[in-house]
């Protein structure tokens, strides 16, 4: 039975040209995390593999940085970065846990972070 939950940074906003940290945290499970994938809609941004470390997708290397922790830092934000981001935790033996973050990149300087909140976990067995 999958007991884990993912906590994310939730709905967040940031200013154009700035940076933002995307964070997820998996709790309430003793499952071993084998890999975390970070995705933006239909593109894989980066992976952190327990054995092999961090790897950033070649098309994002210039403005995506690993961390802190299992999180991801997006730099030089543009309005095109607005949208959904997903952290996908591959675990053993549970399977896959997915967290969702919505980022809005604003033209003005009124951007502010949303509060952290719990989201229901989605899971798919491999």
């Amino acid at each position: 039975m999958m007991t884990g939950t993912i906590e994310t940074t939730g709905n967040i906003s940031a200013e154009k040209g700035g940076s933002i940290i995307l964070q997820c945290h998996l709790s309430s499970t003793t499952a071993q995390v084998t890999q975390v994938n970070w995705e933006q809609q239909d593109q894989l941004l980066a992976i952190c593999n327990a054995d092999l470390g961090w790897h950033i997708s070649p098309s994002f290397k210039d403005r995506v940085a690993p961390g802190p922790g299992l999180g991801l830092t997006l730099q030089s934000l543009t309005v095109n970065d607005t949208g959904e981001y997903f952290c996908i935790y591959h675990t053993y033996p549970d399977g896959t846990y997915t967290g969702r973050i919505f980022l809005e990149v604003l033209e003005s300087s009124v951007a502010e972070h949303g509060a952290r909140f719990q989201i229901p976990h989605h899971h798919h067995h491999h």
Partner: antibody, heavy 117, light 107 residues
């Protein structure tokens, strides 16, 4: 120029072990993964495992766990793949490749391993 | 493990005509798919990475598309030197499984 040069062909008896080397040159050895892929006659390419030469971290396909060992010697920029308890089905061409995780951009020339009694 | 299923197994195309190869993943792999060309007696060569990015030096007649579970490699105008076996491979999670290959020949 990036190059991966593999050791020569091997003929082994069932139950024996084989160790294939892959010498890298033309790039920073510890900045890329080294992946191992094989192709048995008439079969698809099969991923076997990978090493991060910088950290020494390895990841193996489940079917090879306990039978394959991938290592890397940073001082000589050489990776090794050792496969034990050989059987006839292990007859294949074994390739090393430089990995960016998201793709394998340079490949060795391949090493033919024949397992026969 | 993620299973990559290629179709067709083989393809005969006239010189200058379009060749299309499909690859289906057994589960979501985002855009983490690469395509390789493998000629007899040679090592595989990278053509496409991240589903649609052409690798350095690869002719622009090769293109890739797709995301999620369905992917396509297209050779827009087949040349004699394109005769080979083509493989897709997923890099979404280990083990980095390959498709079964598609043999492309001249009709």
């Amino acid at each position: 120029e990036v190059q991966l040069v593999q050791s020569g062909a091997e003929v082994k008896k069932p139950g024996a072990s084989v160790k294939v080397s892959c010498k890298a040159s033309g790039y920073a050895f510890t900045n890329y993964l080294i992946e191992w892929v094989r192709q048995a006659p008439g079969q698809r390419l099969e991923w076997m495992g990978v090493i991060n030469p910088g950290s020494g971290g390895t990841n193996y396909k489940e079917k090879f766990k306990g039978r394959v060992t991938i290592t890397a010697d940073k001082s000589s920029s050489t990776a090794y793949m050792e496969l034990s308890s050989l059987r006839s089905e292990d007859t294949a061409v074994y390739y090393c490749a430089r990995g960016e995780y998201f793709f394998f951009d340079y490949w060795g020339q391949g090493t033919t391993v024949t397992v026969s009694s | 493990d993620i299973v990559m299923t290629q179709s067709p197994d083989s393809l005969a195309v006239s010189l200058g005509e379009r060749a299309t190869i499909n690859c289906k993943a057994s589960q979501h792999v985002s855009n983490a798919v690469a395509w390789y060309q493998h000629k007899p007696g040679q090592s595989p060569k990278l053509l496409i990475y991240s589903a649609s990015y052409r690798y350095t030096g690869v002719p622009d007649r090769f293109s890739g598309s797709g995301s999620g579970t369905d992917f396509t490699l297209t050779i827009s105008s087949l040349q004699a030197e394109d005769v080979a076996v083509y493989y897709c491979q997923q890099h979404y999670n280990t083990p980095h499984t390959f498709g079964g290959g598609t043999k492309v020949e001249i009709k």
